[in-house]
Interface confidence: medium
């Protein structure tokens, strides 16, 4: 089996002129392509992998929401030679957001890493952005985390920082098959320089207060982080947008809430060859669109192309 091979870390790693083909090893009977897109209110980026895969042919796509950070995951596996160039590997509408000046800053200030490498997203190196409220949602918290995509024996990971709705979340995450967006939230100007070591705290659990030694031993209270739940596979012919049914006023993990699944019929992942800037295009700058419009995510047609790197 011959497959396209490439790795894209928010760059042009899967651009047309950088497309490579690889011969798969014995026993490998599927080509795979996976794309994970992340959108903050200040822009969006995607990571992608193409190569020789494992498993069975099929499609899976899913929309996820982590405290106002939107993610979209797509996986496509196929069994014909060079069949893994059907997904649009970049986003079509928001990078960069463009008309942010039309929004009124709400006073919060965060570091922003949208498609930046780990080297450029260290400590206080990344750009600082003013948060604003969008689509009736309040973005006053800051987020520090990572998006990770694993496919074709390759793992791609990029940092994610920006404005979010929650100000206290700790090690929260949303997942798809081989895809994870996770991190922590904080409150205060530029507080998201490094939240890797943030410990769990929930306002519903009283903080630990040191008291004089009691005469009898008190039972200990331990906060449990329940962000490790893995979502189940979405139907292969629908786009599932998973979002909380209520505003996230509480600080629970998204997995602890009732979830509403909206299915868009006919969200086929296949499309004509549109290439690196063809009909569907490789994604890029345009005006900031309504955050509730999930159509801006990739994959409604338009093949994107593979390239250098890979498995």
């Amino acid at each position: 089996l011959e497959c396209y091979s490439c790795v894209q870390k928010a760059d042009d790693g899967c651009s047309p002129h950088r497309m490579k083909t690889v011969k798969c090893g014995p026993g490998v009977d599927v080509c795979t392509e996976a794309v994970g897109a992340v959108e903050t209110i200040h822009g969006q980026f995607s990571v992608a992998v193409r190569g020789c895969g494992s498993g069975i042919p099929g499609k899976n796509d899913r929309g996820l929401d982590l405290h106002g950070l939107l993610a979209f995951f797509q996986l496509q596996q196929c069994s014909e030679d060079r069949c893994n160039a059907k997904l649009n590997l970049t986003l079509r509408g928001l990078n960069p957001a463009g008309n942010e000046s039309a929004y009124e800053p709400n006073g919060a200030e965060c570091y922003s890493c949208v498609g930046l490498s780990r080297e450029k997203c260290q400590g206080s190196m990344p750009p600082v952005v003013n948060c604003y409220n969008a689509s009736g949602r309040v973005y006053k918290g800051c987020f520090d985390g990572n998006v990770t995509l694993t496919a074709a024996n390759v793992t791609v990971s990029l940092p994610v920082r920006g404005c979010v709705q929650d100000e206290t979340c700790t090690r929260d995450g949303v997942t798809g098959p081989g895809f994870t967006l996770s991190g922590s939230c904080c409150q205060g100007p530029r507080c998201n320089a490094d939240l890797r070591n943030k410990t769990y705290f929930s306002p519903r659990i009283p903080p630990l207060v040191l008291l004089p030694p009691p005469t009898t031993a008190a039972p200990s209270t331990r906060a449990q982080n329940s962000s490790s739940t893995t979502s189940t596979a979405a139907p292969t012919t629908t786009t599932s947008i998973i979002k909380p049914t209520t505003a996230q006023a509480s600080h629970t993990s998204p997995h602890e809430m009732d979830l509403e699944v909206i299915q868009e019929e006919g969200a086929s992942l296949s499309g004509g060859a549109a290439g690196h800037g063809g009909t569907a295009g490789h994604g890029g700058a345009a005006g900031h669109q309504d955050r509730s419009n999930m159509e801006k995510y990739p994959g409604k047609g338009g093949a994107q192309i593979p390239a250098k790197g890979g498995s």
Epitope: S5, A10, D11, D12, S15, P16, H17, R18, M19, K20, T21, V22, R82, T90, R92, N95, P96, G115, A273, A274, G275, H276, G277, G278, T279, A280, G281, H282, G283, G284, A285, A286, I305, A307, K308
Partner: antibody, heavy 117, light 112 residues
Framework: EVQLLESGGGLVQPGGSLRLSCAAS????????MSWVRQAPGKGLEWVSY????????YYADSVKGRFTISRDNSKNTLYLQMNSLRAEDTAVYYC??????????WGQGTLVTVTS | QSVLTQPPSASGTPGQRVTISCTGS?????????VHWYQQLPGTAPKLLIY???KRPSGVPDRFSGSKSGTSASLAISGLRSEDEADYYC???????????FGGGTKLTVLG
Amino acid sequence: EVQLLESGGGLVQPGGSLRLSCAASGFTFSSAWMSWVRQAPGKGLEWVSYISSSGSTIYYADSVKGRFTISRDNSKNTLYLQMNSLRAEDTAVYYCAREGLWAFDYWGQGTLVTVTS
Amino acid sequence: QSVLTQPPSASGTPGQRVTISCTGSSSNIGAGYVVHWYQQLPGTAPKLLIYDNNKRPSGVPDRFSGSKSGTSASLAISGLRSEDEADYYCAAWDDRLNGPVFGGGTKLTVLG
């Protein structure tokens, strides 16, 4: 219909500067990787520079690195090439080309840049 | 000197089959990068003829075909016609130069 229209070429002395423009229409310019490719008189094609859809990824050929700057204005559907410290060997027809279908699938008609004293 | 090597000229009579070669190295064609072919008719801009080694954009006759093996590629034109008289260029990505590279071009002459 996809159209790419270059402008800004002309006669310039060595060491001088020129700014080429490429007006795009008939496709979503903000979603397209774009390149400049040049062709010296009677010679072959030479890739000059390449810019991603958002402008965040840029490459240059070694022959123009440090002298030429590629940029784009997606609100105006326009690609630019700022050429400084021009040399006689930069004399060529400059084409802007769209990356699509895994290659340069559309080309402009070209604009001639002549560097001579 | 071009990174990809093509014969400077080729010729054939109408109806004949002509093949144009394109030889690269381990940093471009040999690295697995796909090859594209462009046709440039006299006095006009280049036009994409073959992409992804052997695929034709819509509107390109099936008389044109491409292939790739190892560090080289070739363009075949069967049933040669007078309107095929043009310059033909191969192109591929090059790791060392970090950009697409072109062959020096082959001038195809249709005799008679």
